[in-house]
Amino acid sequence: IWELKKDVYVVELDWYPDAPGEMVVLTCDTPEEDGITWTLDQSSEVLGSGKTLTIQVKEFGDAGQYTCHKGGEVLSHSLLLLHKKEDGIWSTDILKDQKEPKNKTFLRCEAKNYSGRFTCWWLTTISTDLTFSVKSSRGSSDPQGVTCGAATLSAERVRGDNKEYEYSVECQEDSACPAAEESLPIEVMVDAVHKLKYENYTSSFFIRDIIKPDPPKNLQLKPLKNSRQVEVSWEYPDTWSTPHSYFSLTFCVQVQGKSKREKKDRVFTDKTSATVICRKNASISVRAQDRYYSSSWSEWASVPCS
Amino acid sequence: RNLPVATPDPGMFPCLHHSQNLLRAVSNMLQKARQTLEFYPCTSEEIDHEDITKDKTSTVEACLPLELTKNESCLNSRETSFITNGSCLASRKTSFMMALCLSSIYEDLKMYQVEFKTMNAKLLMDPKRQIFLDQNMLAVIDELMQALNFNSETVPQKSSLEEPDFYKTKIKLCILLHAFRIRAVTIDRVMSYLNAS
């Protein structure tokens, strides 16, 4: 058993069919010695008396908010949560496996630049009685500070018969140098509590590997005289690290017809302009990627040919 | 530590071109190592990230873009910097800074070159003949060093008398390639920045 936060305790249950469970001794936080009684959750039924209460925790019904009282007055609370291990594996029932980039990916994180700021998100089908808390650090043995905000519900989607909820959190490394070469990964730890179930999820990454620039901005077309060609120009996104001559991007320019089946013409360039042939009803899209370290491409920025 | 005597190449274009070739070569070599050594811990997640130049060179600090010298986190790095005099940064004596930066890059390349050559000699003794260093990568390191045009004592290749542990050597190769790729990215950024300046 360990303390998650004040008056909230996590009982680790290594479960197998004939598992004996965990013996837990709760102590009432009071100088009083006599006349102490214990209750569970909202029930007024007395579970036991005395300064300590011993319980055998074997299933979720044994967890909950234990309260000690004296003469109708509440003395202290202890909320017991269960963290379940089955076949040597901690449960992952609360969050959905996003399966990208690989199986057992529960947390996904992205950074728009090298400033040390990043966003992580996760999915669940649970809508109520759910709380998250996020901690992060650079490295684990001699951790350096990363500050994370509160996790918030960022999107709701309908997937077949189920509703899916997306939560996200923003974190910022306390002293980040954009030019630094990372040797220790960022660690992100999410504590998830659903009713009386506790689970924790972790992700470890280098900022350089989760970079995904914003799409190029100010995408414009300039028709070339007496030609079907156009000059496409764009700018670096505002959120990208500066100076741009040091943090350079490379770009992919695509001409796409109305039909998805039509052949796509693609041009790759390090410049912020390109000359392409604009077909009728086609659209021109540009996306960006770090020029020197191949992490993710940005989303497309698009303009119609007409 | 004595710095090599700096006679940097007046045109940055050759260095930019060579640094791009270097990044391409090391990235290809790393990809090849990951595929060939698929049953070894060779991915970024599996290896320990070691920097053989740590405490010996300070490329990141010495080559910091002017715009980032205002960022305290970039200056309060835990690595020792060539630039101990803060006012030097403020006044930005460009040619002096550039010399420090390029000599630091040169030193990096020299250290990696020695390590890779020593490692290749061991890998050539492996009866499995599983993986060798790409000669193109070694050549590109050499070309960039020549383009940087520094006069520096040659470092003798490390020789070892004991029987090589090929498993350890291959893991060390992965560690080295990952670190060198990261440094090659920094070098490419620096060359691009200097070229634009």
Epitope: L40, Q42, S43, E45, I55, K58, E59, F60, G61, L82 | -
Partner: nanobody, 126 residues
Framework: EVQLVESGGGLVQAGGSLRLSCASS????????RGWFRQAPGKEREFVAA??????TYSDSVKGRFTISRDIAKNTVFLQMNSLKSEDTAVYYC?????????????????????WGQGTQVTVSS
């Protein structure tokens, strides 16, 4: 999944006693509460007793006569029935709830339960 198997039913004289057992297997860690319900011919299934950790609750009709208890080690719940009456004649069902209610009295509702046993017949002759 949770499996429940009842035993201990039978024919008994009015005023007599019986002890019903309900053994649970499968993913029993997910259980929040266990309960006993009964169904007499032509009647609705009604709540008898429930247990969660050390908490117990009873229907008014059996209070003082029946006792629900739990053997943690054996994953078994018992219903000790004393002073049996002819109106206690019914099929007795064991149930397990895997939903959490902070208000324990919610476990006296039939729809709070997710898993049910096959039932065991109790006949009280007068």
């Amino acid at each position: 999944e949770v499996q429940l198997v009842e035993s201990g039913g039978g024919l008994v004289q009015a005023g007599g006693s019986l002890r019903l057992s309900c053994a649970s297997s499968g993913r029993t860690f997910s259980i929040y509460a266990r309960g006993w319900f009964r169904q007499a011919p032509g009647k609705e299934r009604e709540f008898v007793a429930a247990i969660r950790s050390g908490l117990t609750t009873y229907s008014d009709s059996v209070k003082g006569r029946f006792t629900i208890s739990r053997d943690i080690a054996k994953n078994t719940v018992f219903l000790q029935m004393n002073s049996l009456k002819s109106e206690d004649t019914a099929v007795y069902y064991c149930a397990a709830a895997v939903n959490y209610f902070t208000d324990f009295t919610d476990y006296s509702k039939r729809d709070s339960y997710d898993y049910w046993g096959q039932g065991t017949q109790v006949t009280v002759s007068s």
